[in-house]
């Protein structure tokens, strides 16, 4: 707490400029009006002012606005910002998606920190859902915000959101995220043609059931490796060989370098070894030519 | 050891064909798709397409499209690939070259397509 | 089509040298579940065929010597020759195949001073 003390002759502030970075705090919180300082927020980031001192203008708007402060002020704090808690933060209604930028500006570069994550969250929650032009934003300035969010929080972005994701968005999404996804892209894509639509939903197939892995192999598609290996392992096993190569295309010959990995190697062991020599890349494992195959699974659930 | 044997040169005449030849040898023919690159003069690589010699499954780089066929022969460990419609354009070094990784390659046919 | 772009295009450095050289991709060829870079560098002697060095941007083949270190992820990727050897005199090639057409960089001529 700064202590109260009366402005010195001549030193009250009339307006906030260069001057005030040679007061000292207990000047600066005795001469500087509030309310000059609520009205005049934008000028503060043009001014060196010491992290002491903008210990003291925060202070000021603290007492001017114990409720939470107006958007018109929140839209110019600037490197103010970087002094606000997640508490302050709480106490706020954002509602401009410019206020949001202008913030998230402040924090570029660096990671997501817990003053950012509540501004967000208010934010998104202020607007009831997350909207193309918010998550063309929040992507723009955290690539990896998509997956840093529930499974519940992802199931209110609408599907006309999903044209502003980037495949990078999706990069670290776990299979659970991108199930919530996946229907949401299936939907936003829906009216595009085949080879358009594929590189589209590409990035949110993690998601994908077998039956749809089964209609893109169907048409032509050629599906990377590094996308293959990221399907899920419970759609990718009832996949045939003649399914998966044509899913793969070309890119089959890398079945080869990957059989070790999941969901290649699981795949291997439930496919014929007749059908998997038909690929001409020498993989073993499969099921000796002979042998019957029993679906268990099937078999419990009958019994 | 692996072998991947092309004859040295091939010259033939504009608007001609010409099949070029690749006989492996030392593995399993069938484990290993075959692919096939062109090599201009002083230029880089490119390549033309792979075929599976397991089944004759074949993919082509769309530039090669309307210029490459790429078969195989199991039965003498060979695969082909014919050009057809021939420009001075096509006047390469044309490599074949084993598996994903290109591990082994042919010697190589240098064609020269002159009048 | 995925670019590969090589630098330098031609380097002379004198036998025991260490030389470097570099391979970019216009996008990333990480396969991010096995952690392969799918991405090798193939060298290619005057009046030979092209012959693999090094696979999966690090692995090197068999019978390479260890001279030859191959480092790097995503897009961009690096060649290494510690200690020149004349017979090293060759152009040095890196080929994506993380993606059909599978490419090529205009590759780097190494001369020996």
């Known amino acids: 707490e700064v202590e109260k003390t009366a402005c010195p002759s001549g030193k009250k502030a009339p307006e906030i400029d260069e001057s005030l970075i040679f007061y000292k705090k207990w000047e600066l919180e005795a001469c500087v009006d509030a309310a000059l300082l609520a009205t005049q927020m934008d000028r503060v980031n043009a001014i060196p002012f010491t992290y002491e001192q903008l210990d003291v203008l925060k202070h000021k708007l603290d007492e001017l606005y114990p409720q939470g402060y107006p958007e018109s002020v929140i839209q110019h704090l600037g490197y103010l910002f970087l002094k606000m808690s997640p508490e302050d933060i709480r106490k706020w209604n954002v509602t401009s998606l410019e206020t949001l930028k202008a913030l998230l500006e402040v924090n570029k570069g660096h990671e997501m920190s817990p003053q950012v994550a509540t501004l967000i969250d208010r934010f998104v929650k202020g607007r009831g859902q997350l909207d193309k032009d918010t998550l063309d934003t929040l992507t723009a300035f955290y690539p990896g915000y998509l997956c840093s969010l529930s499974p519940e929080e992802l199931s209110s972005v609408p599907p006309s959101s999903i044209w502003a994701v980037r495949p990078q968005d999706l990069d670290t999404c776990d299979p659970r995220q991108l199930d919530v996804l996946y229907p949401k892209a299936r939907l936003a894509f829906q009216n595009m043609n085949g080879s358009e639509y594929f590189v589209k939903i590409q990035s949110f197939l993690g998601g994908a059931p077998t039956e749809d892995l089964k209609a893109l192999s169907q048409q032509n598609v050629s599906m990377d490796l590094a996308t293959f290996m990221k399907l899920r392992t419970d759609a990718v096993l009832p996949l045939t060989v003649a399914e998966v190569q044509k899913l793969l295309g070309p890119h089959v010959e890398g079945l080869k370098a990957e059989e070790r990995h999941r969901p290649v190697r699981d795949w291997i062991l439930r496919q014929r070894q007749d059908d998997l020599d038909t690929l001409g890349l020498g993989l073993q494992g499969g099921i000796p030519n002979g042998y019957l195959v029993l679906d268990l699974s099937m078999q419990e659930a009958l019994s | 050891q692996v072998q991947l044997q092309q004859p040295g040169t091939e010259l033939v005449t504009p608007g001609a064909s010409v099949k070029l030849s690749c006989k492996a040898s030392?593995?399993?023919?069938?484990?290993?798709?075959m692919h096939w690159v062109k090599q201009r003069p002083g230029q880089g690589l490119e390549w033309i397409g792979n075929i599976n010699p397991s089944n004759g499954d074949t993919f082509y780089n769309e530039k090669f499209k309307n210029k490459a066929t790429l078969t195989v022969d199991k039965s003498s460990s060979t695969a082909y690939m014919q050009l057809s419609s021939l420009t001075s354009e096509d006047s390469a070094v044309y490599y074949c070259?084993?598996?994903?990784?290109?591990?082994?390659w042919g010697q190589g046919t240098t064609l020269t397509v002159s009048s | 089509d995925i670019v590969m772009t090589q630098s330098p295009s031609s380097l002379a450095v004198s036998v025991g040298q260490k030389v470097t050289m570099s391979c970019k991709s216009s996008?990333?060829?990480?396969?991010?579940?096995?952690?392969?870079?799918?991405l090798a560098w193939y060298q290619q002697k005057p009046g030979q065929s092209p012959k693999l060095l090094v696979y999966?941007?690090?692995t090197k083949d068999s019978g390479v010597p260890d001279r030859f270190i191959g480092s790097g992820s995503g897009t961009d990727f690096t060649l290494t020759i510690n200690s020149v050897q004349a017979e090293d005199l060759a152009d040095y090639f890196c080929?994506?195949?993380?993606?059909?057409?599978?490419?090529f960089g205009g590759g780097t001529k190494l001369e020996i001073k």
């Open positions: 999966f941007a690090s």
């Open positions: 996008q990333s060829l990480l396969n991010s579940s096995s952690q392969k870079n799918y």
């Open positions: 030392g593995y399993s023919f069938t484990s290993y798709w």
């Open positions: 070259a084993r598996g994903w990784l290109r591990d082994y």
């Open positions: 080929q994506q195949h993380y993606t059909t057409p599978y490419t």
